[in-house]
Interface confidence: low
């Protein structure tokens, strides 16, 4: 259908609220304002165009809603909530829309919903139930299989004096109900660890990205849970060595493939287990990229090509023999 | 300068219609949500209507909900309410106020007012 | 809808003096991040000017002497040393949801 320029108008209880729903049912060639709407695609694209809210009257049959390039700012509970509900809605982008605050249950009433980007948005606050959409600590399992939250990460004068990392991290292990989540991308967040409990309550995960963060350890990481996971990326991040723990783990994934271009690896000691490892292994792509940062005199060596001599360890001498 | 002048208020009869005009000014007018804020004589302020920036999405207070219509022209920088079966309850000034696009913001800009008045 | 209550509903404070203006929310209009509470001044003849947003930020241009705290229902707007020209209604106003309500106004006169 051609795109038509309508717009409704809500109760008072509008736009912020759970039980904000659109007063009559959309008609079916119905188009909100500012966007492109194709029935036969099932498709409705509300693209740069400055939106402050979620259009209210978008048409009954959308299936994919492009919300990109807006300044939406703050998603209420209900957001999405109509009536009838938006029962096919299966993938959901609201990247670069300004998003710096969402809330409890902004994804309710969106039982279809399989993919959702949040890329590209300041999340200053990102509320524990965002995607449960109820503080129980079992919720009903979320229908999301594709969770995409890359560069989300506000400014640092936003960001409330408090861990980044355990927000998103509430709000991915809330109620357990993201236990069917497939792929989850975090990156470019400017994460300094992962909390060691997120993978082991992701179960289902195949595809997590994880790549241009600040990661400097994966000691605490457990992956043994993640017997499905098929791509892991870790490149770009501040890596300086894989332990034995994480590399048995890794090895043991049956279906694994990992990514570690771009990491500072420090070529010492330390590392003659991982170089070893990557010597055996087939779950790394591109090992023959990977490269030594530090110390300097290792600097661009590649990690295939160290021997055990290469990799040694200034020895720690007593307070006695010690120089300023 | 950021500048809002509203025009189109006077005398009109219960029953009758008013057209209210913002002209807005000194900003990108198409980027910013509008409301309508008014005030009955020695009383304090009533939110009645918004639009959001591109048309969107409008809302209404109970108040004037049926009655009022709130639009926009963006080509024309100007925001509208279509005021219709008054009531001496509707006598008030009228303000337009901007919103930015963070509603934690607050109306950061209003205009001088326009005066209606209800009377048979 | 939300119901914002001003207090007191009159202030007389001698020049120089603190003011406190009160302002309590019938619910919550504070996320654990930001709170959606604002402050306007309206003198005489005039449109209300914003002073304060989300609850402690003072708007471009407002004198220091204003400020702002609170979170989730309980507000207050201080004036830290009251000037003549301060004299004017003051109104707090939630934008956490619609409609937008307003409080009953603080009329606020030199002692």
């Known amino acids: 259908s051609s795109p038509t320029s309508s717009a409704s108008s809500f109760s008072s209880s509008a736009p912020f609220l759970a039980s904000a729903v659109s007063a009559q049912p959309p008609l079916p060639d119905q188009c909100p304002a500012l966007c492109e709407c194709s029935e036969a695609a099932r498709t409705v694209k509300c693209v740069n165009r400055n939106l402050t809210e979620v259009p209210t009257d978008l048409p009954a049959y959308v299936r994919n809603l492009f919300l990109t390039g807006n300044q939406l700012a703050v998603l209420p509970a209900g957001a999405f909530a109509r009536r009838p509900p938006l029962a096919e809605l299966a993938a959901l982008n609201l990247s670069g829309s300004r998003l710096d605050e969402v809330r409890a249950g902004a994804f309710e009433h969106l039982p279809s919903l399989r993919q959702l980007d949040l890329s590209h948005n300041p999340l200053a606050d990102l509320s524990p139930f965002a995607f449960s959409g109820s503080n129980a600590s079992v919720s009903a399992p979320s229908p999301l299989v594709e969770l995409i939250l890359n560069h989300i990460v506000p400014p640092e004068d936003e960001r409330q004096n408090r861990s980044f990392e355990g927000m998103v991290v509430a709000a991915l292990l809330a109620g357990r109900a993201l236990q069917g989540l497939r792929r989850l991308e975090l990156a470019s967040n400017h994460f300094l660890y992962l909390p060691r409990d997120v993978l082991a309550q992701l179960p289902s995960l195949r595809h997590l990205d994880l790549s241009n963060n600040s990661l400097v350890s994966l000691t605490y990481v457990s992956f043994r849970n993640l017997t499905h996971l098929e791509s892991l990326h870790l490149e770009d991040n501040a890596l300086k060595v894989l332990h034995n723990g994480t590399l048995a783990e890794l090895q043991g994934l049956p279906h694994i493939r990992v990514f570690l271009d771009n990491n500072p690896w420090v070529c010492d000691c330390h590392m003659a287990d991982m170089v070893t490892w990557l010597k055996e292994t087939e779950v790394v792509q591109g090992k023959d990229r990977l490269t030594c940062a530090y110390p300097e005199k290792m600097r661009n060596r590649v990690l295939l090509e160290l021997n055990s001599a290469d990799l040694d360890c200034d020895p720690i001498l007593p307070p006695s023999l010690q120089t300023s | 300068e950021v500048q809002l002048v509203e025009s189109g208020g006077g005398v009109v009869q219960p029953g009758r219609s008013l057209r209210l005009s913002c002209a807005a000014s000194?900003?990108?007018?198409?980027?910013?949500?509008m409301h309508w804020v008014r005030q009955a004589p020695g009383k304090g302020l009533e939110w009645v209507a918004y639009?959001?920036?591109?048309?969107?999405?409008?809302y209404y207070a109970d108040s004037v909900k049926g009655r009022f219509t709130i639009s926009r022209d963006n080509s024309k920088n100007t925001l509208y309410l279509q005021m219709n079966s008054l009531r001496a309850e509707d006598t008030a000034v009228y303000f337009c106020?901007?919103?930015?696009?963070?509603?934690?913001?607050?109306?950061?800009?209003w205009g001088q007012g326009t005066t209606v008045t209800v009377s048979s | 809808d939300i119901v914002m209550t001003q207090s007191p509903d009159s202030l007389a404070v001698s020049l120089g003096e603190r003011a406190t203006i009160n302002c309590r929310a019938s619910?919550?209009?504070?996320?654990?991040?930001?709170?959606?509470m604002h402050w306007y001044q309206q003198k005489p003849g005039q449109p209300p000017k914003l002073l304060i947003y989300?609850?402690?930020n003072l708007e471009s241009g407002v004198p220091d002497r204003f400020s702002g705290s609170g979170s989730g229902t309980d507000f207050t707007l201080t004036i830290s040393s009251l000037q003549a020209e301060d004299v004017a209604v003051y109104y707090c106003?939630?934008?956490?949801?619609?409609?937008?309500?307003f409080g009953g106004g603080t009329k606020v006169e030199i002692k």
């Open positions: 639009i959001s920036s591109g048309s969107s999405t409008f």
């Open positions: 000194g900003f990108t007018f198409s980027n910013f949500g």
């Open positions: 989300s609850s402690s």
């Open positions: 106003q939630h934008s956490w949801e619609i409609p937008y309500t």
């Open positions: 619910q919550s209009v504070s996320s654990s991040t930001f709170s959606y």
């Open positions: 106020a901007r919103s930015p696009a963070y509603y934690r913001y607050g109306l950061d800009y």
